[in-house]
């Protein structure tokens, strides 16, 4: 595929990535799938500058990111290393809380109303952010 050189309509460019901010809510898996269908992924926060950028755009609203521990260890959806990477958890989080009564623990990460992160039940219908890198090859066939 051809290399994407500018962001799609209604996406916002920042530091060679493109971001799309939802205004409705979905479960984490549905949000993840939505981004994949857009040839993108749920946002992967790799730096303090990226954290601040996303936070400015989403405001004080619970919003999914591309971080989960559904298979054990915490993993970013694009393979970015979690252990050595940027983290911005709220105090005492993640806590894999079981007391919500919805079955299981909390396996998906989201931005809270103050921007710091929390783990929550993946079925909750939160807003989400998709991200795609400008320098990666797009899956669309080149125009002839």
């Amino acid at each position: 595929g051809s290399e994407r050189t500018c962001c799609p309509v209604n996406w916002v460019e920042h530091e060679r990535s493109c971001y799309w901010f939802s205004r409705s809510g979905k479960a984490w898996a549905d949000a993840d799938n939505y981004c994949r269908l857009e040839d993108a992924h749920l946002v992967v926060v790799t730096s303090w500058e990226e954290q601040k950028f996303v936070q400015r755009h989403i405001g004080p609203v619970n919003t999914w990111m591309g971080l989960h521990d559904q298979n054990g260890p915490w993993k970013w959806v694009d393979g970015t290393d979690y252990e050595t990477g940027f983290k911005n958890w709220r105090p005492e989080q993640p806590d894999d809380w079981y007391g919500h009564g919805l079955g299981g623990g909390e396996d998906c990460a989201h931005f809270t109303d103050d921007g710091r992160w929390n783990d929550d039940v993946c079925q909750r219908p939160y807003r989400w952010v998709c991200e795609t890198e400008l320098d990666k090859a797009s899956q669309e066939p080149p125009l002839l």
Epitope: S47, W48, F86, K87, D114, R116
Partner: antibody
């Protein structure tokens, strides 16, 4: 112009607490995170944490967790850093610094905290 | 935590000299690095942010370069007011960390 003006020098005994203030002017106080950085005599710089004056969220360096509290009063555009259970090795100059792009773009003049019995 | 190292730890130079200070991060920080100048008894002053962007009001003889793990601060022609200690700092992830400093003094 942006200015960060800190409170005056303090002398404390081991085990006591100190609260340093940092009054901001020349910009929208709630629009930028405020960091605290300390420097022991003749030593390098050590980041302590930040507060978001807009929503009161904080993030403290693990080394200071449980001993430090950062607060703010938006009505007077002032950030505060309280450090408890002081030890002699907490003797340092404490600076507030405004969050910039991958940097601290403006710094307070510093507050010397001396811990001595 | 990300460790920051600087070299040299001190350098003796003369007015007009070109001075280069290097900073290395223990893991990749992309371009999220700042450089500060500090004089005795004063607060640090921001010179360079995002590895190569010159802070407003800072003379153009200061420049920064690098990305990933290796970074450089260059003073193209040292002036009398440049004798100071210089620190690099990573602002990629918490805890933010500083290099140990490089003292530039008069030869």
């Amino acid at each position: 112009q942006v200015q960060l003006v800190q409170s005056g020098a303090e002398v404390k005994k081991p085990g006591a607490s100190v609260k340093v203030s940092c009054q901001a002017s020349g910009y929208t106080f709630t629009g930028y995170h405020m960091h605290w950085v300390r420097q022991a005599p003749g030593q390098g710089l050590e980041w302590m944490g930040w507060i978001n004056p807009n929503n009161n969220a904080t993030n403290y360096a693990q080394k200071f967790q449980g001993r430090v509290t950062m607060t703010r009063d938006t009505s007077i555009s002032t950030a505060y850093m309280e450090l408890r259970r002081l030890r002699s090795d907490d003797t340092a100059v404490y600076h507030c610094a405004r969050d910039g792009t991958s940097s601290f773009d403006y710094w307070g003049q510093g507050t010397l905290v001396t811990v001595s019995s | 935590d990300i460790q920051m190292t600087q070299s040299p730890s001190s350098v003796s130079a003369s007015v007009g000299d070109r001075v280069t200070i290097t900073c290395r991060a223990s893991q990749g920080i992309r371009k999220w690095l700042a450089w500060y100048q500090q004089k005795p008894g004063k607060a640090p002053k921001l010179l360079i942010y995002a590895a190569s962007s010159l802070q407003s009001g800072v003379p153009s003889r200061f420049s920064g370069s690098g990305s990933g793990t290796d970074f450089t601060l260059t003073i193209s022609s040292l002036q009398p007011e440049d004798f100071a200690t210089y620190y690099c700092q990573q602002a990629n992830s918490f805890p933010f960390t500083f290099g140990p400093g490089t003292k530039v003094d008069i030869k």
